[in-house]
Interface confidence: low
């Protein structure tokens, strides 16, 4: 950052985009500000206007092409800067050198579904969205489920430690109403973070039959 | 027209310092990043680091406790300091940069300066 | 790191002759490089990205390969061609160059 009170971060989604925060205390709301991305080694530039998020803070997604095609790689490295205008011309507020596969954060898993239902258990999938071929295998998952009554900051964390895109949800209740999340991490990259949680999907035990447990 | 000049090389005892300069020209260090690979005599290429256009830096992992690339953007120039040099740093140096398009290797070379580690 | 080996270490070879130079890496790699460099020049970039040639290349140098395989050809060689010849791999940090090919006429 130029200076101490400006912060500015973006994560690559492994495939063709990389999306940025940045916040500046005391900084003008009504000021036009962008995300200028200057890859050291390829043919292309690209730029994406900053938009309020809160009263400091600005955002916006570098969009580097189709969603799955592979923009960058382990060895690329991007200029990052931000740019505001005052006046006639742009004035720089910001800048790092970005290394994609060191920053990455993908996108939340989607397609959940029910496999199969019973009445203590709930066989859940999904799918991982737009993320590199190059991680291959190299990919972990957190799970939670929000029981009612609960909360889900309450709700405990089931981490799988690898590339398994399924859960059997064990010890449920029977005939009650549960929600279930997921979201996915790569084992590389020094500042990587968990994706967003996927968006719940709501799922209803069985109820237990009459005169025995199944 | 890209150029890159050396400067700096000579003589340096066994345990001192050495500092190089790259003085770019036909472009600037702000807006490409510029390597330095050395070549001992009669010996191959080694690739020894990188200072990006935004002014972070990569190293071998042989070198990174004694080696720093800097860069002044108002000179438009790069730097190259090694310490604690012994007799097998003795190499010519280049600073080296990448062309335009899509991973098209060094592309730029400077022409190189001698650097000589002996008592 | 990934290791690059260069064969054979040194040729020589006939003015019109093809000369074939192997470079294989210890790991698989996605782009290969290739310089030519003379005797007390800096060295000079003749191949990018596996196959393409660099600005001012005559079009008697070519590359090909994939993986941890590849070949740099010099279709008819000439007189100027009288170099060391290296490979270089940018998959993987640090970079690294093969050993080098000497190449002489007969």
């Known amino acids: 950052a130029v200076n101490g009170t400006s912060r500015f971060t973006c994560f690559y989604n492994s495939r063709a985009n990389i999306s940025c925060v940045w916040s500046q205390d005391g900084a003008l709301q009504d000021t036009s500000c962008q995300v200028h991305a200057w890859p050291d080694r390829r043919r292309w530039n690209q730029t994406c206007e900053l938009l309020p998020v809160s009263q400091a803070s600005w955002a916006c997604n570098l969009i580097l092409g189709t969603p799955d095609s592979q923009k960058l790689t382990a060895v690329d490295i991007v200029t990052l800067r931000v740019m505001c205008r005052e006046g006639v011309r742009w004035r720089m507020m910001a800048i790092q050198d970005f290394k994609p596969f060191e920053n990455l954060r993908l996108m939340a898993p989607i397609s959940l579904q029910v496999v199969h239902v019973e009445t203590h258990r709930c066989n859940i999938s999904w799918k991982i969205s737009q993320a590199s071929h190059y991680f291959e295998r190299h990919l972990e998952f957190e799970a939670r489920t929000l029981s009612p009554g609960h909360t889900w900051e309450e709700a405990p964390l089931m981490t799988l430690k690898q590339k398994q895109e399924w859960i059997c949800l064990e010890t449920l209740t029977p005939d009650t109403q549960y929600e279930f999340q997921v979201r996915v991490k790569p084992l590389q990259g020094e500042f990587t973070t968990w994706s967003p949680w996927s968006q719940p999907l709501a799922f209803r035990t069985k109820p237990a039959a009459l005169g025995k447990d199944t | 027209e890209v150029q890159l000049l050396e400067s700096g090389g000579g003589l340096v005892q066994p345990g001192g310092s050495l500092r190089l300069s790259c003085a770019a020209s036909?472009?600037?260090?702000?807006?490409?990043?510029v390597h330095w690979v050395r070549q001992a005599p009669g010996k191959g290429l080694e690739w020894l680091g990188v200072i990006w256009s935004g002014g972070s830096t990569d190293y071998n992992a042989a070198f990174i406790s004694r080696l720093t690339i800097s860069k002044d953007n108002s000179k438009n120039t790069v730097y190259f300091q090694m310490n604690s040099l012994r007799a097998e740093d003795t190499a010519v140096y280049y600073c080296a940069r990448a062309g335009d398009a899509n991973y098209d290797g060094f592309a730029y070379w400077g022409q190189g300066t001698l650097v000589t580690v002996s008592s | 790191d990934i290791q690059m080996t260069q064969s054979p270490s040194s040729l020589s070879a006939s003015v019109g002759d093809r000369v074939t130079i192997t470079c294989q890496a210890s790991s698989s790699v996605s782009f290969m490089y290739w310089y030519q460099q003379r005797p007390g020049k800096a060295p000079r970039l003749l191949i990018y990205d596996t196959s393409n040639l660099a600005s001012g290349v005559p079009s008697r140098f070519s590359g090909s390969g994939s993986g941890t395989s590849y070949t740099f050809t010099i279709s008819s060689l000439q007189p100027e061609d009288i170099a060391t010849y290296y490979c270089?791999?940018?998959?993987?940090?640090?970079?690294?160059f093969g050993q080098g090919t000497k190449v002489e006429i007969k």
């Open positions: 270089q791999q940018w998959s993987t940090y640090p970079l690294t």
């Open positions: 036909g472009f600037t260090v702000t807006s490409y990043a």
